[in-house]
């Protein structure tokens, strides 16, 4: 017989020879990192037809790392379903807990023993320190010193000393989230007041107000014979300016050689070049002005 078969988990005892006589026996042992569990044979004989009798390494089992329990408030998940060396054990924590230590352990071979690459991690409760205090405002639960996962606080602004109220800029409610950090930055309380929006040859058609505070929204239309250059809708933003800027109403050119004017500013505009009679602020007698504006 020629050289005996080789296996993943089993190796020949002694040196292999190039040829073996009929009836000659060779013995195998489990390789390093594997251990033998009877009854399967670990030897073979050179048969008279010059082939080796059947043998397998199925009696050799990988060394196994010790079983690790789920961490308290978490879970250990075997990546490939067994504890044999080469296995990966992934750790995750339940919602509201965070991992202290390595999130993956590897089953490794040290000499002939399979051991885990480190200590199992712990799952600790997510806690947040109190959220930031803000000028001209306050948050709920200001007396609490430690917040648990998903505990929420709500910010509100103080009454303003002057005629204009403080506006809350940002998220009014924030919660204790992953990484023991708050879900959003603390908001800001400040007076936000936009100027009265004046449009020559046009007028405001919605969003009327005594004063225009944060997020106030105003819409305009132009007089007959004028078209809107800019957006018909503007919003009072946190820096006390209108965004987009207050539009202008420009005179519609009646000269046939001139191109119909189109808006150069960002914001709603016709998606086609309407005839002069279809400009915003230049409606047909039987329809409202806003029918000719994009929403």
């Amino acid at each position: 017989c020629e050289a005996p078969p080789t296996f993943e988990a089993m190796e020949l005892i002694g040196k292999p020879k190039p040829y073996y006589r009929v009836g000659e026996r060779v013995d195998y042992k489990c390789k390093k990192g594997y251990f033998y569990i009877p009854p399967l044979a670990t030897h073979t004989i050179c048969d008279r037809n010059h082939t080796w009798l059947p043998v397998s390494d199925e009696g050799c089992y990988r060394e196994m790392c010790p079983h690790i329990r789920d961490p308290l408030n978490g879970e250990a998940i075997l990546a490939n379903g067994s504890y044999e060396f080469g296995a990966e054990l992934h750790f995750i924590c339940n919602e509201g807990y965070y991992l202290i230590g390595k999130d993956i352990l590897y089953c490794e071979l040290k000499d002939t023993v399979a051991i885990w690459s480190g200590k199992p991690p712990l799952c600790e409760k997510i806690l947040c320190t109190p959220p930031p205090k803000i000028k001209n405002g306050k948050h709920t639960f200001s007396e609490v010193e430690v917040f648990e996962y998903l505990d929420a606080v709500t910010y509100s602004c103080d009454p303003a000393p002057g005629p204009d109220p403080f506006s809350l800029i940002g998220e009014s409610m924030i919660y204790c989230g992953n990484n023991s950090t708050w879900s959003h930055a603390a908001p800001e309380c400040k007076v936000v007041k936009c100027r009265f929006p004046v449009v020559e040859n046009g007028k405001q058609i919605s969003g009327f107000g005594k004063k225009f505070y944060y997020k106030a929204t105003v819409m305009f239309e132009c007089d007959k014979g004028y078209y809107l250059n800019g957006s018909d809708k503007i919003v009072c933003e946190s820096n006390s300016t209108w965004d987009p800027p207050v539009p202008k109403c420009l005179k519609v050119s009646t000269s046939p050689t001139t191109k119909s004017p189109t808006s150069s500013a960002s914001g709603p505009r016709p998606t086609y070049k309407p005839p002069v009679s279809n400009y915003p602020g230049y409606p047909k007698p039987d329809e409202g002005i806003l029918n000719n504006l994009d929403d």
């Epitope: 007041k193 100027r195 009327f208």
Partner: antibody
């Protein structure tokens, strides 16, 4: 609190020109929106125009061709330039601080009288 | 331009009377209406802005109401110091315009 004082009024012949001044004390004229308003027995109160803090202007179209509003920040003064004056322009002229960017007039000066007569 | 028409053009009241002045706009102006009082020999002074908001320092016997085209200024109990000419002013649209005035006298 800023005080606005009008000056430059007087007698002028029809067709003539006059420049009214509005001097600010206790504050910067460029920090406020300044409107000009006039009052006469025959025509009542008439808003003429405004110069905004950013230097932009809006006018009453009835006077746009003859009246111009400007500002000189170095002199801390706003101006109303009136050309081609007519007898019906005879009135007391007020410069007025627009209330905090809103078109209501809470800060009236004493005004300056302009008489257009030959 | 938007026209504002005040009525009556003049009225005479006794101290303590309730006085009502109306202002009608030639087109809808939402609540963008102010009221002024010009006392004899003085410049006008702001009484009410945005239809019903009292300007600082104005006594609460003054009140304003209305919306759209019809507006009212009321003095609940008129006093001697309330004499003068009352003006309304709109600011929804340029040019900002004033009413012709209502003269209030005390009997």
């Amino acid at each position: 609190e800023v005080q606005l004082v009008e000056s430059g009024g007087g007698l002028v012949q029809p067709g003539g020109s006059l420049r009214l001044s509005c001097a600010a004390s206790g504050g910067s004229v460029s920090s406020y929106d300044i409107s000009w308003i006039r009052q006469s027995p025959s025509r009542g109160l008439e808003w003429l125009g405004v110069i905004w803090t950013d230097g932009g202007t809006n006018y009453n179209s009835a006077f746009m061709s003859r009246f111009t509003i400007s500002r000189d920040d170095s002199k801390n003064t706003a101006y109303l330039q009136m050309n081609s004056l007519k007898t019906e322009d005879t009135a007391v002229y007020y410069c007025e601080r627009v209330y905090d960017g809103y078109p209501w007039f809470a800060y009236w000066g004493q005004g300056t009288l302009v008489t257009v007569s030959s | 331009a938007i026209q504002l028409t005040q009525s009556p053009s003049s009225l005479s009241a006794s101290v303590g009377d309730r006085v009502t002045i109306t202002c009608r706009a030639s087109q809808g102006i939402s609540n963008y209406l102010n009221w002024y009082l010009q006392k004899p020999g003085q410049s006008p002074q702001l009484l009410i802005y945005y239809t019903s908001s009292l300007h600082e320092g104005v006594p609460d016997r003054f009140s304003g109401s209305g919306s759209g085209t019809d507006f009212t200024l009321k003095i609940s109990r008129v006093e001697a110091e309330d004499v003068g000419v009352y003006y309304c002013q709109q600011y929804i649209k340029l040019p900002w315009t004033f009413g012709q005035g209502t003269k209030v006298e005390i009997k």
